[in-house]
Interface confidence: medium
């Protein structure tokens, strides 16, 4: 229905709380450089405004869309040019022409410090003193690193935040209590981060119908009771949701998020058996919940998937009357009986079975063309599984540091072009797959090892694309968002690479590495892990396990010498003479 | 807005046949399964025969098997019973609904949207 003020309507339905941290989520993902205290008066002008307009629908303005509104705000903002180079040229440019431009504008690596934890007294004395100020300050630097983050999403994480401070800053031990909790919500905020941007991609790269279909498997998989056409309505709701957070309509994406959530607790029945506990939590926590659901048990007496797509006489006229609908109904009757493969592996299977169509029903005999085409899915499964099977082995024997090590080699060879700060990132995230995946039941490994490792790789394309280096990897960024993980699997060591000169500074440490913290002095070893095999991209792994391990007793005797600055001066060129004359 | 029209009904002798249609308007037909249930004089609802969305999955109330036949045709959002052998006790009201859901073990049918129905009548 139509509202006549946009804003009153998104404020009332909100409330006054959401409406102010989604506000702030949206600037500080617009704008990212700009100061807390900026955006925080922005917000505070907006909302005050949104007020006006649930008093008087007709007062001046309120008729006004909220990329307008909003738009205007941040373009009266002063020195936007200095600030912002040419995302200042945005403004000069009409609704929705200026909100595209805004978006284009989205830096996915802004240079940004670390987000840096106060220590843990630090921390209270200022959750305690103003919650409001402190949980904005949250949603702020988390917003400004990661300018796709699902807005909704993000509040929830800062429901948590704002849950963990309220239980252990009444602690004796505030530390003991906080790090591992926190630990744990940042985790899983920065692992939602990348898979809400892979669902951006997938939405800004190849479009709505993309999405759905991803939408469509994964509820299938979960909810196997329902029928295919709630499953469409309910991927009809979730694309819907997810194109208006991907484009900055964060407000009316958490306003929808809402009412699907209040819409599947309504129809629990006809939707799984698994939602009631979800459905009794606030808002927030019940979308969360809903989002993190368990499948719900697979109905007994499933037929045959082939008696429907390949046995049945009708499959080509079914096809041509309507292919969507009939891709669709294939893809939710196979995606609800295998929640043990990945979405990504499913959309491949269905990609595989539209095109066996699409040719044999061109052909005179299609049923004996299209006879086969489940045989043909072996293939398709076997390489993921194997996938898992041998970096699951891989992880158990050398554990997360040592799998992430493996993973920077591999990938170093397959794209020494690319930023060593970018594949070391990729690397740790790649390699952190094992302790997310591996420890899992067997029919849950390959859909978490698979769709993580998509969404790890889309990020290594979206930061790509800012300054693409490596044709191999813009051949596999380019492709369909599916054969991703596969292509990158499939490529090998890179035989055009001139390796890079060996450069004595690249290898040279200094005391201040004793004081690293253990996170900050492994991305050190592994930042000159990959500068070694940048030299020599044809290392043996024995030839690096020396260097490293060398490597590593070098850091451990001079962090424990009494002259620390001295060791590392001159046993550090010694270090480089061994590594150059071991890689030789 | 959803509309199921339903015709075809009226008087047969015993082991007769009739053929029902019901014509469907105001939303995807072929997304949805489809069901013929009917309601004799003084009894409740009885489900007769449920189709999948092309129609490669029929299933029959056991009163039913063996004389009855459901279709549907998509590109004319028609769904069809076809009714053979017919007795006096498949006398009833016949409605085509819409699935909502539909457990096939019985424990979980919903039907969303229903036509006004039509008459069938087996007498001598």
């Known amino acids: 229905e139509a509202h006549k003020s946009e804003i009153a309507h998104r404020f009332k339905d909100l409330g006054e709380q959401h409406f102010k941290g989604l506000v702030l989520i949206a600037f500080s993902q617009y704008l990212q450089k700009c100061p807390y205290e900026e955006h925080i008066k922005l917000v505070q002008e907006v909302t005050d405004f949104a007020k006006t307009c649930v008093a008087d629908e007709n007062a001046e303005n309120c008729d006004k869309s909220i990329h307008t509104l909003f738009g205007d705000k941040l373009c009266a903002i002063p020195k936007l040019r200095d600030n912002y180079g040419e995302l200042a040229d945005c403004c000069a440019k009409q609704e929705p022409e200026r909100n595209e431009c805004f978006l284009q504008h989205k830096d996915d690596n802004p240079n940004l410090p670390p987000f840096q934890r106060p220590e843990a007294e630090a921390m209270c004395t200022s959750f305690q003193e103003n919650p409001t100020s402190f949980l904005g300050h949250y949603l702020h630097e988390v917003a400004r690193r990661h300018p796709y983050f699902y807005a909704p999403e993000l509040l929830y994480y800062a429901e948590k935040y704002n849950e963990v401070l309220t239980q252990c800053c009444t602690e004796s031990d505030k530390a003991a209590c906080l790090t591992p909790k926190l630990d744990a919500v940042k985790e899983k905020a920065l692992v939602a981060a990348v898979r809400q941007r892979m669902k951006c991609s997938s939405m800004q790269r190849f479009g709505e119908r993309a999405f759905k279909a991803w939408a469509v498997a994964r509820m299938s998989q979960r909810f196997p009771n329902a029928e295919f056409a709630e499953i469409t309505k309910l991927a009809t709701d979730v694309t819907k949701i997810n194109k208006e957070c991907c484009h900055g309509d964060l407000l009316e994406c958490a306003d929808d998020r809402a009412e699907l959530a209040k819409y599947m607790c309504e129809n629990q029945a006809t939707i799984s058996s698994k939602l009631q506990a979800c459905c009794d939590k606030p808002v927030l926590q019940k979308s969360q919940c809903l989002a993190e659901i368990e499948h719900d048990n697979i109905p007994a007496d499933l037929p045959s998937i082939a008696a429907d797509f390949v046995e049945d006489k009708e499959v080509c006229k079914n096809y041509a009357e309507a292919k969507d609908v009939f891709l669709g109904t294939f893809l939710y009757e196979y995606s609800r009986r295998h929640p043990d493969y990945s979405v990504s592996l499913l959309l491949r299977l269905a990609k595989k079975y539209e095109a066996t169509l699409e040719k044999c029903c061109a052909e005179g005999d299609p049923p004996a063309c299209y006879g086969t085409v489940l045989a043909e899915f072996q293939p398709l499964v076997e390489e993921p599984k194997n996938l898992v099977k041998t970096n699951c082995e891989l992880y158990e024997k050398l554990g997360e540091y040592g799998f992430q090590n493996a993973v920077l080699v591999r990938y170093t060879q397959k794209a020494p072009q690319v930023s060593t700060p970018t594949l070391v990132e990729a690397a740790r995230n790649l390699g952190r797959v094992g302790t997310k995946c591996c420890t899992l039941p067997e029919a849950q490994r390959l859909p978490c090892v698979e769709d993580y490792l998509s969404a790890i790789l889309n990020r290594l394309c979206v930061l790509h694309e800012k300054t693409p280096v490596s044709e191999k990897v813009t051949k596999c960024c380019s492709g369909s968002l599916v054969e991703r993980r596969p292509c990158f699997s499939a490529l090998t060591v890179d035989e055009t690479y001139v390796p890079k000169e060996f450069k004595a500074e690249t290898f040279t440490f200094h005391s201040d590495i004793c004081t690293l913290p253990d996170k900050e002095k492994q991305i050190k070893k592994q930042t000159a892990l990959a500068e070694l095999v940048k030299h020599k991209p044809k290392a043996t792994e024995d030839q690096l396990k020396t260097v490293m391990g060398d490597f590593a007793q070098f850091v451990d005797k001079c962090c424990k010498a009494a002259d620390k600055d001295n060791c590392f001066a001159t046993e550090g060129p010694n270090l480089v003479a061994r590594s150059k004359e071991a890689l030789a | 807005e959803v509309q199921l029209l339903e015709s075809g009904g009226g008087l047969v002798q015993p082991g007769g046949s009739l053929r029902l249609s019901c014509a469907a308007s105001g939303f995807t037909f072929s997304l949805y399964r489809m069901v013929w249930v009917r309601q004799a004089p003084g009894k409740g609802l009885e489900w007769v025969s449920m189709i999948s969305q092309f129609g490669n999955q029929t299933y029959y109330a056991d009163s039913v098997k063996g004389r009855f036949t459901i279709s549907r045709d998509n590109s004319k959002n028609t769904l069809y019973l076809q009714m053979n052998s017919l007795r006096a006790e498949d006398t009833a009201v016949y409605y085509c609904?819409?699935?909502?859901?539909?457990?096939?073990?019985?424990?979980?049918?919903?039907?969303?949207?229903w036509g006004q129905g039509t008459l069938v009548t087996v007498s001598s």
């Open positions: 609904a819409k699935v909502r859901s539909w457990d096939q073990t019985g424990g979980r049918r919903t039907f969303d949207y």
